[in-house]
């Protein structure tokens, strides 16, 4: 039993952690594995997590791992029964990726712009709260060409849309995902899409 | 610059006990896990602990565990060995080492800074 | 444990020459293998590690090649400063283990 690719992890610095990690053959990962972590200093309880298969030879495990605070440094030791496969240290605050914002829904707005609105994943006393920036993604549905991206750094997750920007009768989906800067985060996963028909009038909301 | 010094090493009867202690200076000592590696009169290199940055976990061969512990104070920037009920084949030089890279993992055991040795001789 | 098999043990060789010492690991390592130097009475300094990347400080005429289970170090172009013992290590998990060393002497 060998490790092919060692675990890579990453925390949403609030409540879980991930890792995952390939083996060098198929593996049934819930009966053959387990990842131990603990917080690294002496006297710290130890925690098992078991493991899920995500492909034949990758493996998954969600952590749960509360109240992160910058410093803390978590112990991994990746176990085949009594055998030691692999051992490395995890910083959290320094693995940040973000929750997936929220509710994304798109709505008419004045002056022919759409006003898309989604919800900041983290609670207002979270520390990631007021460090998110957010990239949205807005695809014709029916021509690949047609796409933007748009950057939105600052804090309020809205974006206002000039209807004249997309072209008439088509389709649009939308879709939005955050990072944090200041944590120097990978990017959250992408937000289920919402579609949303680009006309002039009558507004009414979707 | 890097220096590992190590101290504590002499004679010991088989069955007796001894502290390695290993004086750590030019890097961020509570960065890095550290181990101890022993060199046999033979010339073989044998690993025989180490420990995470934090002090929280340790790990042994099966042939020291529950005689030997390793332990750390990063506050002193210093790496220990407890050996008890020793026996004659403990007789080694004793070398203090250091991962090779921050954090990281088992796979980067590698050392790339050795200490000068302490020699640990078992025998009646 | 994986075994690393050190070959030769000893071998002379001349100022000026090349010469190639051998690893073998029990079991595929994939690239984490490392080599040291050791000469008489002093510790081990690391020359190799990720099986062919040059330690900080180490002359360019020492090379590590190899992956999975045959791994090699060769010397190019010796020099009276590199004669002394050669150790391999995987690095590929817990425990590490080192092979029973190579002596390079002087001929």
């Known amino acids: 039993v060998k490790v092919l690719h060692e675990p890579s992890c990453f925390s949403d610095y609030i409540s879980t952690s991930v890792c995952q990690w390939k083996m060098d053959h198929p593996t049934n990962c819930s009966a053959e594995l387990r990842l131990s972590y603990q917080l690294d200093f002496m006297g710290s309880e130890n925690h098992t997590c078991v493991p899920e298969n995500r492909e034949d030879s990758v493996c998954v495990c969600s952590m749960p791992i509360d109240d992160a605070v910058e410093a803390d440094v978590y112990q991994l030791d990746l176990w085949a029964g009594q055998q030691l496969l692999w051992s490395g240290s995890f910083q959290p605050s320094k693995h940040v990726k973000p929750r997936t914002p929220g509710n994304l829904t798109v709505y008419p707005n004045i002056s022919h712009t759409w006003l898309l609105m989604w919800t900041n994943p983290y609670p207002t006393e979270n520390h990631l709260h007021s460090e998110l920036t957010y990239m949205v993604n807005v695809s014709n549905d029916n021509d690949p060409e047609d796409f933007k991206v748009y950057n939105v750094t600052y804090m309020g997750p809205t974006l206002r849309l000039a209807a004249s920007t997309l072209k008439s009768g088509a389709s649009y989906s939308a879709r939005v995902r955050a990072w944090a800067q200041t944590y120097n985060s990978t990017w959250s996963d992408w937000s289920p899409s919402t579609t949303w028909l680009n006309y002039y009038e009558p507004w009414e909301q979707h | 610059e890097v220096t590992l010094v190590e101290s504590g090493g002499g004679l010991v009867q088989p069955g007796g006990s001894l502290k390695l202690s290993c004086a750590a200076s030019?890097?961020?000592?509570?960065?890095?896990?550290m181990y101890w590696v022993r060199q046999t009169p033979e010339k073989r290199l044998e690993w025989v602990a180490y420990i995470s940055p934090g002090g929280g976990s340790t790990y042994y061969p099966d042939t020291i565990k529950g005689r030997f512990t390793i332990s750390r104070d990063n506050a002193k920037n210093t790496l220990y060995l407890q050996m008890s009920r020793l026996k004659s084949e403990d007789t080694a030089m004793y070398y203090c080492t250091r991962h090779g890279s921050p954090y990281g993992s088992s796979r980067g055991a590698w050392f790339a800074y050795w200490g000068q040795g302490t020699l640990v001789t078992v025998s009646a | 444990d994986i075994q690393m098999t050190q070959s030769p043990a000893s071998l002379s060789a001349s100022v000026g020459e090349t010469v190639t010492i051998t690893c073998r690991a029990s079991?595929?390592?994939?690239?984490?293998l490392a080599w040291y130097q050791q000469k008489q009475g002093k510790s081990p300094q690391l020359l190799v590690y990720n099986g062919k990347t040059l330690a900080e400080g180490v002359p360019a005429r020492f090379s590590g090649s190899g992956s999975g289970t045959q791994f090699s170090l060769k010397i190019n172009s010796l020099q009276p400063e590199d004669f002394g013992s050669y150790y391999c290590q995987h690095h590929d998990g817990i425990p590490v283990t080192f092979g029973a060393g190579t002596k390079l002497e002087l001929k």
């Open positions: 030019g890097f961020t000592f509570s960065d890095y896990y």
């Open positions: 079991e595929n390592i994939y690239s984490y």
